[in-house]
């Protein structure tokens, strides 16, 4: 650092900026001598408004420094990102966003829960709001799933009228024939592939209604499809294996007591879906009077032994192999309670006794020619077989 050129004049003695220090410290600085500035933790080098990671100035032959002195400014993380369906609170002080400041994110109570972390973020020396787990992106307020106003039990086809908030995941799909679906998260609808197959290349033609109780009521939340994903293993007009589809909505819907997503089954869900366990199907499909229901109806039906169901559909007019391992059956041997045309795509839901949340076990798929027929059963897509498929699509799109 010491280059003695006696002809050259020394540069002005540099003064380190506040919250910074200078190195090396010398008695004087002459031609080609240099110094660097280092800021204390939580302070950043700025040349005016320009960020610098490092700074060094060199003494020139005319006795001036080649660079102006930078400043060490306290790191400011700036206003934190907004949290959809949540809020942010300044803990350190009103609007304080500088080094070591703390903020607390929280989600709207009841209908949203925080995913990823506890919501506490600190403004770190690198200028980013950071959680205790080291995440820089804000948390996510995920809709709480499987909440229902309905108490379990109680005695569609052979069903009864639903009350507000009983089936808040219920989605009415118009645009082709009447069909149904179930809300997942706040921007996906789970349905049957056969119910929306005709619209697979024209997602925008689907008229999607949430929060409705009466099929023809003007009181509903309108949603539109951004994209339709039909299971690649589904073949139209060749049976109902892999009869499952997802609709991505073009906007997130606001969750409330009348619009709430259904849960996907946990790994342990099979224990709540054994033979004779009760599931609930809901929809606006044909009732015993042979007409589409005006009011949302529901029916509680037991799961039927798979072999028994397979056998029931091996007799003509059905062909052998109609019931696959990707299906589950539900209904009464005596008949009278079933889902029917117009219910397709709706969820067959079960109560998870451990979490006390409702989850989708089946999707209304197909059944006997005559709904509620004795010795025949409603056939549902077995959702638990498709969890990897569902999660893959939702995470990629």
């Amino acid at each position: 650092h010491h280059h003695h050129h006696h002809a050259s004049q020394p540069c002005p003695y540099p003064m380190a900026p506040p919250n910074g220090h200078l190195s090396p410290v010398q008695a004087k600085y002459i031609l080609k001598d240099s110094f660097s500035i280092f800021c204390e933790p939580g302070y950043e080098l700025l040349q005016g408004h320009l960020p610098l990671k490092s700074f060094a100035a060199v003494c020139q032959k005319d006795g001036s420094w080649d660079q102006p002195m930078p400043s060490c400014s306290i790191v400011d993380c700036g206003p934190p990102d907004d949290l959809p369906s949540g809020r942010v609170e300044y803990i350190t002080g009103p609007e304080v966003t500088t080094y070591k400041a703390v903020i607390q994110y929280s989600c709207e109570e009841t209908f949203y829960t925080m995913k990823v972390n506890d919501g506490k973020y600190v403004c770190e020396a690198d200028g980013f709001w950071t959680s205790s787990k080291g995440e820089r992106s804000p948390p996510v307020c995920e809709p709480v799933c499987g909440l229902s106003a309905r108490t379990t039990g109680g005695r569609i086809y052979g069903g009864q009228k639903a009350k507000p908030g009983d089936f808040p995941w219920q989605v009415l799909i118009l645009g082709g024939s009447t069909a149904a679906g179930a809300l997942l998260y706040d921007n996906w609808v789970l349905t049957a592939a056969h119910a929306i197959y005709e619209q697979k290349h024209d997602a925008s033609s689907l008229d999607i209604r949430l929060g409705a109780l009466k099929r023809l009521s003007p009181h509903y939340t309108q949603a539109w499809a951004e994209a339709v994903f039909i299971h690649e293993g589904y073949t139209h007009d060749a049976g109902f294996d892999n009869d499952i589809a997802l609709i991505k909505l073009n906007n997130k819907v606001v969750i409330n007591s009348n619009i709430t997503p259904i849960c996907l089954p946990r790994k342990e869900a099979e224990s709540f879906m054994r033979t004779d366990d009760i599931g609930t199907a809901s929809g606006w499909g044909l009732t015993q009077r042979g007409l589409l229901a005006r009011n949302l109806m529901y029916v509680d039906i037991p799961i039927v032994d798979h072999q028994k169901c397979t056998a029931a559909y091996e007799k003509p007019p059905y062909s052998g192999g109609s019931v696959t391992a990707n299906m589950l059956c539900a209904g009464l041997e005596s008949g009278g309670k079933d889902s029917c045309r117009g219910d397709a795509g709706g969820a067959l839901v079960f109560l998870d006794n451990e979490t006390q949340r409702w989850f989708v076990g089946g999707i209304v798929s197909w059944g006997s020619m005559n709904c509620g027929e004795a010795g025949q059963y409603g056939v549902y897509t077995k959702v638990i077989n498709y969890i990897p498929w569902i999660k893959n699509i939702i995470s990629n799109f």
């Epitope: 040349q47 408004h49 960020p51 610098l52 990671k53 002195m69 400043s71 200028g127």
Partner: antibody, heavy 117, light 112 residues
Framework: EVQLQESGPGLVKPSQSLSLACTVT?????????WHWIRQFPGNKLEWMGF???????NYNPPLTSRISITRDTSKNQFFLQLNSVTTEDTATYYC??????????WGQGTLVTVSA | NVLMTQTPLSLPVSLGDQASISCRSS???????????LEWYMQKPGQSPKLLIY???RRFSGVPDRFSGSGSGTDFTLKISRVEAEDLGVYYC?????????FGAGTKLELK
Amino acid sequence: EVQLQESGPGLVKPSQSLSLACTVTGYSITSDYAWHWIRQFPGNKLEWMGFISYSGRTNYNPPLTSRISITRDTSKNQFFLQLNSVTTEDTATYYCARSYDYWFGYWGQGTLVTVSA
Amino acid sequence: NVLMTQTPLSLPVSLGDQASISCRSSQSLVHSNGNTYLEWYMQKPGQSPKLLIYTVSRRFSGVPDRFSGSGSGTDFTLKISRVEAEDLGVYYCFQGSHVPVTFGAGTKLELK
């Protein structure tokens, strides 16, 4: 010697998004400094749009804040400009540049973007 | 926004002449850290602008010493002591002291 090169579509339709990339050679964008986007309108008026710093923090020209996003891909040593809801008023030559103690010491050669139906 | 006003908008010169371009800002360019972030750029047709001068008077590397900058507060000047053919183009002053940073409208240096 650091070199910067802009790339992206030369024609964008109104209401769509304009997306440009700046590929940097001869210097790592994470090593130091700020990396800027500037545009020059027909008639030669120059406007600074914003920068992304070596650490990934951004600073935007306030009138553009609601429409602009500057991001980066450190593995490719590139940084990007996205400008949403463009109008014919966004027709300009777009430059990327690097600062130090000065604002724009090194510039790309610029790319003309026309906004037209 | 800080308005940067350049005069003249056009400057006809003969080779070897001294040229002087003035730039006035609508407010002081002294930053809170004491530095003045006033810069000069030059642009030739079909090329990107090039930095000439920063912090009022410092020459950028490779810039000939016939270019000099001076001024303080709100009034600044770029001088070219002997104009050469390669100096013809448009000159812009720029302030980096206040965000948003802003450019002047430009001064065209051309042959008489």
